[in-house]
Interface confidence: low
């Protein structure tokens, strides 16, 4: 009596080690195909067929200008990506059978998007503006404006700002204020102008000096022997032709005029190296 | 049978010019790169230039650019080469090199037999 | 500028197996060529995309490409094999040639 339940257990273990339950996952680098568990193939293999009760997954190797990067199950390998020069891409990195080929762009461009299937011609930072950073195959040229003290007086995906000239480092003066476009322009310090700055400064005090001594000899000058009740001070009225009184501004603007202004040695305009085609 | 036939070498004093031909038959001249290397007398390989099958992007060798220009005409089946201001040392055999492709992956499978170009005064 | 450097000669005994070496930085990241050039004539091309073969190169001709060397191996060396041998890669917009290895078949 007690040996039929016995029997049942015993066949009912026999039956599920034949039997197994059929697996609902697989460990790692395998796949579940018809109720069983088979191993992917390797980077670089393609399947050619699945395992079996008792056959191994077949795999063969990727073909040429092919690649499969995973651990995988694909019947069919994937082209490498052609870089296409008609697009301005070459090849960074060739492919493998297990890596894909990496494009980048040619010198002088820069890819359109991550993926860089395209390029474009580097973009140049126009006069007013320096290159901040140099393009690369990935990026384009980053522009900044030229700063107070610095100027760019090209177009160039290449050159920063340039800082203006120190005229004093040179013993020159300045002739011209510069601009973010454009350099000082310095001047020689003519003996001849200093010749005839000087005097016309000590003109100018001289002048100043007689009027003063005028103004005096008319306050002291008594108009009327009787005394007078306490009068208001009149407006003096200084004649326009008193010595001295306005040749500054004419002879001053006259030298400055005929100063001769000089460009800097070794300051040129500067020519944007040729960009590439 | 494909073939290239360069033509148009010679002599030349320095600071000449030159212009070689490469008539090109046997194949689709459109569809593929074509390239200009030479061989100084004695010395090794030296590229000079290459021109992509249609949009006409070019490059050059630092030796020649600024001197020498590649282009080409498809519709005769022509790849061409402007030498200006040459020197002594472009003295050599200029070979036309047909491309294995579009572009420069399949290295240079079919050569012409090469002109030469002697710059001396 | 890039530089490919090869041995100026290479000998091998007729049979044995010659090995002509190119090196180049990262030059297993680049596709190499490799060039035959006997005297007074044009160059052929023997291996290119590193080890492809073209058609009518006989197959003792083969061709490596990894890390800082190209290798272009001739097995079964025979006494036509003798000539001057160029590698060749693509690096960033220009074509760059090495200076050539003298193979001698004694």
């Known amino acids: 009596m007690v040996r039929l339940p016995l029997q049942c257990v015993l066949w009912g273990c026999l039956l599920t080690a034949v039997h197994p339950e059929p697996p609902t996952a697989c460990r790692e680098k395998q796949y579940l195909i018809n109720s069983q568990c088979c191993s992917l193939c390797q980077p670089g293999q393609k399947l050619v067929s699945d395992c079996t009760e008792f056959t191994e997954t077949e795999c063969l190797p990727c073909g040429e200008s092919e690649f499969l990067d995973t651990w995988n199950r694909e019947t069919h390998c994937h082209q490498h990506k052609y870089c296409d020069p008609n697009l301005g891409l070459r090849v960074q990195q060739k492919g493998t059978s297990e890596t894909d080929t990496i494009c980048t762009c040619e010198e002088g461009w820069h890819c359109t998007s991550e993926a860089c299937e395209s390029c474009v011609l580097h973009r140049s930072c126009s006069p007013g503006f320096g290159v901040k950073q140099i393009a690369t195959g990935v990026s384009d040229t980053i522009c900044e404006p030229c700063p107070v003290g610095f100027f760019s007086n090209v177009s160039s995906a290449f050159e920063k700002c340039h800082p203006w000239t120190s005229c004093e480092t040179k013993d020159l003066v300045v002739q011209q204020a510069g601009t973010n476009k454009t350099d000082v322009v310095c001047g020689p310090q003519d003996r001849l102008r200093a010749l005839v700055v000087i005097p016309i400064i000590f003109g100018i005090l001289f002048a100043i000096l007689l009027v003063l001594v005028f103004i005096k000899k008319v306050a002291k000058k008594p108009t009327n022997k009787a005394p007078h009740p306490k009068q208001e001070p009149q407006e003096i009225n200084f004649p326009d032709d008193l010595p001295g009184s306005n040749t500054a501004a004419p002879v001053q603007e006259t030298l400055h005029g005929c100063q001769p202004v000089t460009q800097e040695d070794g300051k040129e305009s500067r020519i944007s190296v040729q960009e590439r085609q | 049978e494909v073939q290239l036939v360069e033509s148009g070498g010679g002599l030349v004093q320095p600071g000449g010019s030159l212009r070689l031909s490469c008539a090109a038959s046997?194949?689709?001249?459109?569809?593929?790169?074509m390239s200009w290397v030479r061989q100084a007398p004695g010395k090794g390989l030296e590229w000079v230039s290459i021109?992509?099958?249609?949009?006409?992007?070019?490059y050059y060798a630092d030796s020649v650019k600024g001197r020498f220009t590649i282009s080409r005409d498809n519709s005769k089946n022509t790849l061409y080469l402007q030498m200006n201001s040459l020197r002594a040392e472009d003295t050599a055999v200029y070979y036309c090199?047909?491309?294995?492709?579009?572009?420069?992956?399949?290295?240079?499978?079919?050569w012409g037999q090469g002109t030469t170009v002697t710059v001396s005064s | 500028s890039y530089e490919l450097t090869q041995p100026p000669s290479v000998s091998v005994s007729p049979g044995q197996t010659a090995s002509i070496t190119c090196s180049g930085d990262?030059?297993?990241?680049?596709?190499v060529s490799w060039y035959q050039q006997k005297p007074g004539q044009s160059p052929v091309v023997v291996i290119y995309?590193?080890?492809k073969r073209p058609s009518g190169i006989p197959e003792r001709f083969s061709g490596s490409n990894s890390g800082n060397t190209a290798t272009l191996t001739i097995s079964g060396t025979q006494a036509m094999d003798e000539a001057y041998y160029y590698c060749?890669?693509?690096?960033?917009?220009?074509?760059?040639f090495g200076g050539g290895t003298k193979l001698t078949v004694l």
């Open positions: 090199a047909k491309e294995g492709g579009d572009y420069y992956y399949y290295g240079m499978d079919v």
């Open positions: 046997g194949f689709t001249f459109s569809s593929y790169a």
């Open positions: 021109i992509n099958n249609n949009v006409g992007r070019t």
């Open positions: 990262k030059l297993g990241d680049k596709y």
């Open positions: 995309q590193d080890s």
């Open positions: 060749q890669a693509w690096v960033s917009s220009t074509v760059v």
